[in-house]
C-alpha cells in the first residue's frame, strides 16, 4: 500500500534549488530499483517532477497560493521490467501553504461621500472595504484592520468595519466644505510587519440651514418718480446667506413703516434679491418720503438650529418720491354758469380756477379753446379766470354754450389742462307773442249774432319761468266795430264771435280783424295780428258753399272794419 499523507508546500519559494515537496513510497519497494514511480495530474512533469527511483517530488517553479492553492496529482508504482502496477493508482493533494505576500486592496481607489455639516459626532459617512488575497483561514495574513492616516480630528474609522464617522462637533460647511481622508488597511491584524494599502475618501459637507440671512447694510435709499405706475420696480436689496440652495432661499416682506400700503417687495426667484415695487399711485404733493422696514427670512428653517437665533434680518428702506411736473388741476371737473340774454358786452358771467398741483405752484394762465367758441362770444381773463361776454347773446338762438377753457402753466406751456364750461343763457322777455298760425276763416251770410267762427292761439319764443299768459283784444281801431267781437278765454286762447245777424257778401266779402296779443312778463311785449274773415253763402246746415261775390271788382269790397 501507499505510504504518505497530503503534501504541504510553502508558496513563493525563493531558493536556488528545486523546492522539495515530499516522497512517494510504496511498501512494495525493496530498494533494489525494481520499482518505478510515475506522477501524473496537475503540473506533473512541468511544475512537479519525481525521481522515478526514489519517489522524491520537487517543485521546479515558484508557486503562488493566490493563483492556485491546491494541486491534485496521481501516483503510480510499476514494475520496471514488466510495466505492471505494483500499487493501484492513487490521487493525492499538494496544498500550497500561505505566506503573507498580499497587501489589502480597497474596492475603490477613491471614494466620494457626503455628510451634513453640523452632524453629531459618530454620524455615518461611508464604509470603505479592503480585501486581502491571502488565506483568511490560516494565520492573520488576511486579517485586515483599518486606520486613519489623514483626516483627523474630523473623521474616524472603525478598525474592524471600515465605517467612517464624523469625529468633530460643529463641522461647518461655510468654514470648510471639502475634506480628503486617507484610510489604511493593514493585514496581520495590524501588527508590525503586516502589509498595508491605502485609499482616499473625498468627503463633502452638505449644507444645512445654520445661517440666517443678513443684510450687508442697515439702510437703503431709492428714488422713484411720482408717475410710476403700480408694479414698477424701484430698487433691489439683497440679504446674503452663507448657506446654499434651498437653505439660502430668501423671502422678503414689508413688516413696518408708512409705505406698507404704497409699496410691495417680491423675491427675484433667480437672484434671491428683494425687489421693491410700487403698489399704489404715488403723489409727491401728499408725501415725499416713505420709510419701510423690510425683513428677509428663510422660508425653510431647521428646528434644531433655531437656538442660533431668528433666521431673519431687517433693514430700513427709505423711498424718496420725485416730483413730476403735473398739469394744472381745475377746482371742478366741469363748470356750469348762467347769464341773462340781455347782458351787455363785457358782462362777467363767473370764473374758473386752476392750480399747479406741484410743490412749485407755478402760476397759471387761462384761455378759451377757440375751436369750441368759433364766434368768439366769450372771453376769459388770462390772469384770474373770469369769464365775460364779448358779443350779445340770444337765448332763442342758443340756450346752452358749451366751451372749453384751457389752463396753462406760465413757466412750462407744455403743461396744460382743459375743463368743460357750460353756459346757460337765461330768458328775458324780449319777444312778443304771435299767432300760432295764419288765420283765415269764414262767416255765413245768414249767421246769427254771438256765433263762434274762429279760435285763436298764440306762441312766444320766450320761456318765462311761470309759463306763458297771453291776452287777446281787438286793436283800438276795430274795437268799436259792429261786425265782430273777440272773447279772451283766459287760457291763452281767444274766440272771434259774430256781433250781428246776417252778412251780405255782395256788400262786404272780406273783413280784416286786427288783434292785439300781449304777454304778461316784464317788460310787456305785444304784437298785432290780422284775422281774415270771408263772407260766404252756406247751406241750411251752415256748410260753406261759395265765398265768391258775383262781382268783386270794387276795391271797396275789402274792409278792415270789423
Amino acid at each position: 500500500s501507499w505510504m504518505w499523507n497530503q503534501f504541504f508546500l510553502l508558496e513563493e519559494y525563493t531558493g536556488s534549488d528545486y523546492q522539495y515537496v515530499g516522497k512517494l513510497h510504496s511498501d512494495q519497494d525493496r530498494g533494489d530499483g525494481s520499482l518505478k514511480y510515475i506522477l501524473s495530474g496537475d503540473g506533473a512533469g512541468d511544475l512537479f517532477i519525481i525521481n522515478e527511483n526514489t519517489g522524491d517530488i520537487q517543485a521546479t517553479k515558484r508557486l503562488d497560493r493566490e493563483e492556485k492553492p491546491v494541486y491534485i496529482l496521481r501516483a503510480q508504482a510499476v514494475n520496471r521490467r514488466t510495466g505492471r502496477p505494483v500499487e493501484p493508482e492513487s490521487e493525492f493533494i499538494i496544498k500550497i501553504h500561505d505566506i503573507n505576500d498580499n497587501e489589502p486592496i480597497f474596492t475603490k481607489d477613491v471614494y466620494t461621500a457626503t455628510v451634513p455639516e453640523m452632524a453629531d459626532v459618530g454620524t455615518f459617512v461611508v464604509q470603505v472595504t479592503a480585501t486581502d488575497a491571502d488565506d483568511p483561514t490560516y494565520g492573520n495574513s488576511a486579517k485586515v484592520v483599518y486606520s486613519i492616516l489623514q483626516g483627523q480630528p474630523y473623521f474616524s474609522v472603525e478598525s474592524e468595519t471600515g465605517i467612517i464617522k464624523t469625529a468633530l462637533l460643529n463641522m461647518d460647511r461655510e468654514n470648510r466644505e471639502q475634506y480628503q481622508v486617507v484610510i489604511q488597511a493593514k493585514d496581520m491584524g495590524g501588527q508590525m510587519g503586516g502589509l498595508s494599502g491605502t485609499t482616499t475618501v473625498n468627503i463633502t459637507l452638505t449644507d444645512v440651514n445654520d445661517n440666517p440671512p443678513r443684510f450687508p447694510q442697515s439702510t437703503y435709499q431709492f428714488k422713484t418718480p411720482e408717475s410710476s405706475p403700480p408694479g414698477t420696480p424701484i430698487g433691489r436689496i439683497k440679504a446674503s446667506d452663507a448657506d446654499v440652495g434651498e437653505n439660502a432661499e430668501i423671502e422678503y416682506s414689508i413688516t413696518d413703516g408708512e409705505g406698507h400700503e404704497m409699496f410691495d417687495v417680491i423675491t427675484d426667484q433667480e437672484t434671491q434679491e428683494g425687489i421693491i415695487t410700487v403698489k399704489k399711485l404715488l403723489d409727491f404733493e401728499k408725501k415725499k418720503v416713505y420709510t419701510l422696514k423690510v425683513e428677509a427670512s428663510n422660508p425653510h428653517v431647521e428646528p434644531r438650529f433655531l437656538y442660533l437665533g431668528p433666521f431673519k434680518d431687517s433693514a430700513t428702506v427709505r423711498i424718496v418720491v420725485d416730483d413730476v411736473d403735473e398739469p394744472p388741476v381745475f377746482s371742478k371737473l366741469a363748470y356750469i354758469l348762467q347769464i341773462r340774454e340781455d347782458a351787455r358786452i363785457n358782462t362777467t358771467i363767473g370764473s374758473v380756477a386752476a392750480q399747479d398741483p406741484d410743490a412749485a405752484r407755478n402760476p397759471v394762465k387761462y384761455s378759451v379753446d377757440r375751436h369750441t367758441d368759433m364766434d368768439r362770444i366769450f372771453n376769459i381773463d388770462s390772469g384770474n379766470g373770469s369769464i365775460f361776454t364779448s358779443k350779445l347773446l340770444d337765448r332763442e338762438t342758443l340756450l346752452w354754450h358749451n366751451i372749453t377753457v384751457i389752463a396753462t402753466e406760465i413757466n412750462n406751456p407744455k403743461q396744460s389742462s382743459r375743463v368743460p364750461l357750460y353756459i346757460k343763457v337765461l330768458d328775458v322777455n324780449d319777444n312778443a307773442p304771435e299767432f300760432a298760425e295764419f288765420y283765415e276763416t269764414f262767416v255765413c251770410e245768414k249767421a246769427k249774432a254771438d256765433q263762434l267762427i274762429q279760435t285763436l292761439r298764440a306762441v312766444d319764443k320766450d320761456d318765462p319761468y311761470s309759463g306763458h299768459q297771453f291776452s287777446f283784444s281787438l286793436a283800438p281801431e276795430a274795437a268799436s266795430s259792429s261786425n265782430f267781437t273777440i272773447q279772451d278765454n283766459k287760457d291763452n286762447t281767444a274766440g272771434i264771435l259774430t256781433r250781428k245777424n246776417g252778412y251780405n257778401r255782395h256788400e262786404m266779402s272780406t273783413y280784416l280783424l286786427p288783434v292785439v296779443i300781449s304777454d304778461n312778463d316784464y317788460p310787456v311785449q305785444s304784437s298785432t295780428g290780422t284775422v281774415t274773415v270771408r263772407v260766404c253763402a252756406c247751406d241750411h246746415h251752415g256748410n260753406m258753399q261759395s265765398c265768391h261775390a258775383e262781382a268783386l271788382i270794387h276795391p271797396t269790397g275789402l274792409s278792415t272794419g270789423a
Partner: antibody
Amino acid sequence: EVQLVESGGGLVQPGGSLRLSCAASGFTFTTYAMNWVRQAPGKGLEWVARIRIKNNNYATYYADSVTDRFTISRDDSKNSLYLQMNSLKTEDTAVYYCVRPDYGNYGLAYWGQGTLVTVSS
Amino acid sequence: DIQLTQSPSSLSASVGDRVTITCSASSSISSHYLHWYQQKPGKSPKLLIYRSFYLASGVPSRFSGSGSGTDFTLTISSLQPEDFATYYCQQDIVPLTFGQGTKLEIK
C-alpha cells in the same frame, strides 16, 4: 429694447432631431431664467422647458411630454438659449417661442417671434 | 402639477361691453404667480397683467385683474375693437401651465 430671435425650425421626419437657437439682446441675460413655450397649430400655449441661471447651477425643468427627448441649454457668453430636440414625434409640430420672464423672474414678459417646427414623414 | 381652467372657452361680445374671464387653479397659488396674456392670430402672445393685478407696460386701463388662492379674474371694462383676441392665464410654479384659452369674438 429686449429682443429674442429664434432660429433652427424646419421640416423633420419622425424620429429625427433638430436644434433651436435663440439670440437674446437688450437685457442682462445672466440674471434671467429662460423658457421655451410652444403652440401647436390652432391650439393653446404649452410650456416646454426652463433653465435657471448660473447661481442656481443652470438647473433645468421639462414638461412631461418632452422629458428625456428635449434638452435645454444656454451659453451666457453668447447670450444664447438652445433647445436640442431628439426622437421627434408628429405631435411636436408647433411654433416654438423663446421667452424671458418679467423682472423678478415672474411671468413670461418677452416673447420671440417664434420658429415653426414641422414633424412629418 | 397645477391645472388652470378658464371660463368661458369662447365669448361673443359687442364694443362697449364689460367682459369677465375667470381662471380657476387646481390648487392654491400666490397671487405673485398668476399672469394673463393676450394673443392675436399670427402673433406672439403679449403679457397683459402680471402678478394677478398689475398692468403690463402700454396696456390700457380698461383691463384689470383680481383674485387670490384658486380663483382669478380678468376684466375688460369697455370692449374696444382691438380687444377681440384669445386670452390665456398662466401660473409660475414648475411645471409652468397655461389655461386652455378664452376666444373673445365680435357679436
